[in-house]
Amino acid sequence: PPRGRILGGREAEAHARPYMASVQLNGAHLCGGVLVAEQWVLSAAHCLEDAADGKVQVLLGAHSLSQPEPSKRLYDVLRAVPHPDSQPDTIDHDLLLLQLSEKATLGPAVRPLPWQRVDRDVAPGTLCDVAGWGIVNHAGRRPDSLQHVLLPVLDRATCNRRTHHDGAITERLMCAESNRRDSCKGDSGGPLVCGGVLEGVVTSGSRVCGNRKKPGIYTRVASYAAWIDSVLA
């Protein structure tokens, strides 16, 4: 079986995550994303920091980034809406909504994911699924096919220890364990899914991967329900 994907996960079942998006810059994978409405993909604001002069598109219905697949379609972006409070030097408010040039053609391999609206922390220890096309090992290899890993949610107090993230994890963020299994470079903007519901978005702040003392940080979508609704309206 495939080993060591994302970091420490494995290849995802093809098209089993129909909400999964690849945010692309000039035709290459840049970040993950998640389809939250027919014409909207949620990702991370920092993903577009270096994209000023490039063409941003969204790939939906994909398992392989390179191989032809009937469900794959690349959409242009009509509008990019970063959270107004996102800043280059912080991990706070690291959300981005991308409006596709047209409504996505929905089907078994392309479908929006329900997102959490109840602003309550996910219970520590809950196993959540994170998927992406980010690097898969310590060499920095990027995969062609979608990878995923199950990660237990870590309580905020532990995540905020001085030895961990030293108080940086606000109530609008959540953490997941990172001991060998972790999200990593290129997974930013992708979904953290708990019980079939989108709970978090992988932050794109720079962070060492696979180190248990540096847990993965995820933006809690429930904390931004009002902003998401206002943009999608």
Epitope: P2, R3, G4, A28, D50, I135, V136, N137, H138, A139, G140, R141, R142, K185, G186, S206, R207, V208
Partner: antibody, heavy 113, light 106 residues
């Protein structure tokens, strides 16, 4: 097309320092890890370490700590290897590699008085 | 620190012959990479994640193994395969190379 272009050969005196460069084209070094590898004459390969250019985090083999410093400049898409307090043991070809799948042509460093 | 031991250190094979070389780890690893290096040239990635062929590598090359025992096989030796082959593990820091196997053409 992905390419890694390394700086030219260096001839240096014992005790001196040298900085080697590796400039990438065809991809953004922030998207992966950049590695440096040493190969002494007629010897095998030695992994020196790597850098994540997006954040500057490095991981070096302990035997090169204090000897090698890896840095990167994302604005010029270039990774660097600085070697200090050079001795004859540092005479080698030094390679850069991105994610270990694309390699530079190597830079020869000769330490001699 | 994990030590990778390659064997044999030197071997020779005739064109068309099947070639196998091994890489033994001092403790269990998950990922194994294999590289080919010809004299005067940079190393070239052949195999990643134990058994996956890197881009442009002929299908006569294959990799296998698990735990502490890994191998690289060439199904039919060709003259251009004469080179030194190195293994490297990507599971546990630091990430050393093996000592190398020099493959010569008979």
């Amino acid at each position: 097309e992905v390419q890694l272009q390394q700086s030219g050969a260096e001839f240096v005196k014992p005790g001196a320092s040298v900085r080697l460069s590796c400039t990438a084209s065809g991809f953004n070094i922030k998207d992966t890890y950049m590695h440096w590898v040493k190969q002494r004459p007629e010897q095998g390969l030695e992994w020196i370490g790597r850098i994540d250019p997006a954040n500057g985090y490095t991981k070096d083999d302990p035997k090169f700590q204090g000897k090698a410093t890896i840095t990167a400049d994302t604005s010029s898409n270039t990774a660097y290897l600085q070697l200090s307090s050079l001795t004859s043991e540092d005479t080698a070809v030094y390679y850069c590699a991105s994610a270990m799948d694309y390699w530079g042509q190597g830079t020869s460093v000769t330490v001699s008085s | 620190q994990i030590v990778l031991t390659q064997s044999p250190a030197v071997m020779s094979a005739s064109p068309g012959e099947k070639v196998a070389m091994t890489c033994s780890a001092s403790s269990s690893v998950t990922y194994m990479y294999w590289y080919q290096q010809k004299p005067g040239s940079s190393p070239r990635l052949l195999i990643y994640d134990t058994s996956n062929l890197a881009s442009g590598v002929p299908v006569r090359f294959s990799g296998s193994g698990s735990g502490t025992s890994y191998s690289l096989t060439i199904s039919r030796m060709e003259a251009e395969d004469a080179a030194t082959y190195y293994c490297q593990q990507w599971s546990t820091y630091p990430f050393p190379f093996g000592s190398g196997t020099k493959l010569e053409i008979k």
